[in-house]
């Protein structure tokens, strides 16, 4: 913490500008008024203060707003956001998507920090659900965001938000998460025709039950092996050889290369050898 010292004559800041750039820490503490700083926060980000100097500015804001910063200040934190702790952020009430975007921009290119995770949590809780615009924003900055949520948190995602999800956003999701997301996707895309529906639902199929896979097998979807390998084992096991053949279409030949891996291995063991032989792939049950 910077020692309290009087501001030298002529150094009192009349505005937040570049004249402060080479001020020592104690000079910033003594010569910058916290209320002035709060009203001119938008200027701070334009000035390349050192992180040490930003520490002093943060300290001034903390003294001015012990209960947490108002959103008018938060929106313009810029690099100062990197100085915030999760404890600081828990005091905030962030309601504007623009504020969220501004702060995520500062952290762009970095891994999701505890600060960012806390910020997102505060924002989403404040909104009550993960609406489409929020999800759009979060997955744009953090493609893995959706898969970082617990199944309980995912349950608050409305089906309408599913339209914002891209296949790469689901890359790291586990089956429990897809179990929650799949029914929402099914609902969101229910009015699409066969081939368009399959394109949209494909990345969510890791949460699909057997009956939906059976239904898809009747629609000439030609599922690729990568998608098939991500299906729930318990959903694949009851499928007949004929249904899997229809589901995969020309990709059925790929089963041979995957015969030692789940769910293909377990599925093969459940089939009659006669049925497997009809595929002509040399699969041994």
């Amino acid at each position: 913490e910077v020692e309290k010292t009087a501001c030298p004559s002529g150094k009192k800041a009349r505005e937040i500008d570049e004249s402060l750039i080479f001020y020592k820490k104690w000079e910033l503490e003594a010569c910058v008024d916290a209320a002035l700083l709060a009203t001119q926060m938008d200027r701070v980000n334009a000035i390349p203060f050192t992180y040490e100097q930003l520490d002093v500015l943060k300290h001034k804001l903390d003294e001015l707003y012990p209960q947490g910063y108002p959103e008018s200040v938060i929106q313009h934190l810029g690099y100062l956001f990197l100085k915030m702790s999760p404890e600081d952020i828990r005091k905030w009430n962030v309601t504007s998507l623009e504020t969220l975007k501004a702060l995520l921009e500062v952290n762009k290119g970095h891994e999701m920090s505890p600060q960012v995770a806390t910020l997102i949590d505060r924002f989403v809780k404040g909104r009550g659900q993960l609406d489409k615009d929020t999800l759009d924003t979060l997955t744009a900055f953090y493609p893995g965001y959706l898969c970082s949520l617990s199944p309980e948190e995912l349950s608050s995602v409305p089906p309408s938000s599913i339209w914002a999800v891209r296949p790469q956003d689901l890359d790291t999701c586990d089956p429990r998460q897809l179990d929650v997301l799949y029914p929402k996707a099914r609902l969101a895309f229910q009015n699409m025709n066969g081939s368009e529906y399959f394109v949209k639902i494909q990345s969510f199929l890791g949460g699909a039950p057997t009956e939906d896979l059976k239904a898809l097998s009747q629609q000439n979807v030609s599922m690729d092996l990568a998608t098939f390998m991500k299906l729930r084992t318990d959903a694949v096991l009851p499928l007949t050889v004929a249904e899997v053949q229809k589901l995969l279409g020309p990709h059925v030949e790929g089963l041979k290369a995957e015969e030692r891996h789940r769910p293909v291995r377990d599925w093969i063991l459940r089939q009659r050898q006669d049925d497997l032989d009809t595929l002509g792939l040399g699969l041994q049950g």
């Epitope: 334009a46 000035i47 390349p48 050192t50 992180y51």
Partner: nanobody
């Protein structure tokens, strides 16, 4: 490590001009900020002009606006201060200062480099 060497100071009559130069031993093209800071006798240091690489316009203290011009030549790693219509109150030691980086988020100080200064005396 960047070494800064100022030159161009001297004694000059009011109304005349001087051009200060600051030669850097290392590259200044990636510096976050470069400026001229002056310290008059018995007074505090004051930033008179600065180039913020993230901004579109240069900074000038109110007392020198319209009279001083800051510029740089990246190919020569040199910062300049053109001082016109000099006044007695411009008398000071002029330092060249360069900020290379912000430091480390969790503690380390930023890297600011300062020259030894060049004296400008405006007197009739």
């Amino acid at each position: 490590q960047v070494q800064l060497v100022e030159s161009g100071g001297g004694v000059v009559q009011p109304g005349r001009s001087l051009r200060l130069s600051c030669a850097a031993s290392g590259t200044i093209s990636e510096a976050l900020y470069m400026g001229w800071v002056r310290q008059a006798p018995g007074k505090e240091r004051e930033l008179v002009a600065g180039i913020n690489t993230g901004a579109t316009t240069n900074y000038y203290a109110d007392s020198v606006k319209g009279r001083f011009t800051i510029s740089r030549d990246n190919s020569k790693n040199t910062l300049y201060l053109q001082m016109n219509s000099l006044r007695a109150e411009d008398t000071a030691v002029y330092y060249c200062a360069v900020r290379k980086d912000r430091g480390v988020e969790n503690g380390g100080p930023g890297h600011d480099y300062w020259g030894q200064g060049t004296l400008v005396t405006v007197s009739s």
